[in-house]
């Protein structure tokens, strides 16, 4: 996901809806005007706000990177939802890019979890059942299994 900057809102164009802040805040899908007296709507597909706020600008919509699919578009109240393409995943500790899932488990291990957009395949030791974590093994160590193969 490309981390977009926050979009400074220019003076409201005539088509932008205005309303008054309530308790100093503007509703989701709006931001507060520079004089604090009006709520100005975000621009659909360009920027958004998710909560009641007194931000002077709406947040710029995320654009999905290549290697990602768009699950849902950006609206004035919700950011774009992007997901890694099939066969790739995004880890919590490296959210900036989708990584290729491993094709199989190291020798002596069995696959107990499939590749998902948010996790690599999961491997456990045949005997102990303990999880294997770390880099993908060298190809000659790899025992491949088709996605439909049940864990033994």
């Amino acid at each position: 996901i490309t981390q977009q900057d926050l979009a400074p809102q220019q003076r409201a164009a005539p088509q932008q809806k205005r309303s008054s802040p309530s308790e100093g805040l503007c509703p989701p899908g709006h931001h507060i005007s520079e004089d604090g007296r009006d709520c100005i709507s975000c621009k659909y597909g360009q920027d958004y706000s998710t909560h009641w706020n007194d931000l002077l600008f709406c947040l710029r919509c995320t654009r999905c990177d290549s290697g990602e699919v768009e699950l849902s578009p950006c609206t004035t109240t919700r950011n774009t939802v992007c997901q890694c393409e099939e066969g790739t995943f995004r880890e919590e500790d490296s959210p900036e890019m989708c990584r290729k899932c491993r094709t199989g488990c190291p020798r002596g291990m069995v696959k107990v979890g499939d590749c998902t957009p948010w996790s690599d395949i999961e491997c456990v030791h045949k005997e102990s059942g303990t999880k294997h974590s770390g880099e993908a093994p060298a190809v000659e160590e790899t025992v491949t299994s088709s996605p439909g193969t049940p864990a033994s």
Partner: antibody, heavy 117, light 110 residues
Framework: QVQLVESGGGLVQPGGSLRLSCSAS????????MIWVRQAPGKGLEYVGF???????YYASWAKGRFTISRDNSKNTLYLQMNSLRAEDTAVYYC???????????WGQGTLVTVSS | DIQMTQSPSTLSASVGDRVTITCRAS??????LSWYQQKPGKAPKRLIY???SLASGVPSRFSGSGSGTEFTLTISSLQPDDAATYYC????????????FGGGTKVEIK
Amino acid sequence: QVQLVESGGGLVQPGGSLRLSCSASGFSISRYAMIWVRQAPGKGLEYVGFITSDSSAYYASWAKGRFTISRDNSKNTLYLQMNSLRAEDTAVYYCARYTYSDGTDLWGQGTLVTVSS
Amino acid sequence: DIQMTQSPSTLSASVGDRVTITCRASQSISTYLSWYQQKPGKAPKRLIYKASSLASGVPSRFSGSGSGTEFTLTISSLQPDDAATYYCQPNSGIATYGAAFGGGTKVEIK
């Protein structure tokens, strides 16, 4: 002359209460958001909270529950009610006029609050 | 809450020097940032608003720049009267995020 003048500071015992006032002249506070900022001796500026033109108050997380900001537009005066005071609340307290896009454009001279037994 | 990180915390420079102070926001605030000058025993004074707009009555040797998360205050030719502490403050989302000031930069004259 456009100015803000704080009053009500002084020495108070731990656990005690104090109400600070901020009197505005030369402009109507009813048209502005107003902010309270404090500065402990030898330290930096610390945001306390602010009140919108429609009298909705918002606070720094540490001030919630103990401090209350209010205003009396007829007296053109802003208030800061401080309860359950602690030694670490010792500071100069400033009131200021807050304009959304342009920042805090007008400051009072500050009033010193000392919390000590 | 938005955190503001200012650097350096202190600096010493000679009269006539060009001085730059940096302020970093923990999330983007567009150009909605103000700079303040405070002298000992005095209230702060606004110097710059909207990142680069000079407040009324402020000498033109002061300038501000930046947007997003990185901002700078520059004094083009340091004067004895500029010895003070300088603070940055975000101006967008004060109710939403609070209005934490930067930690301050003390400018001393060599």
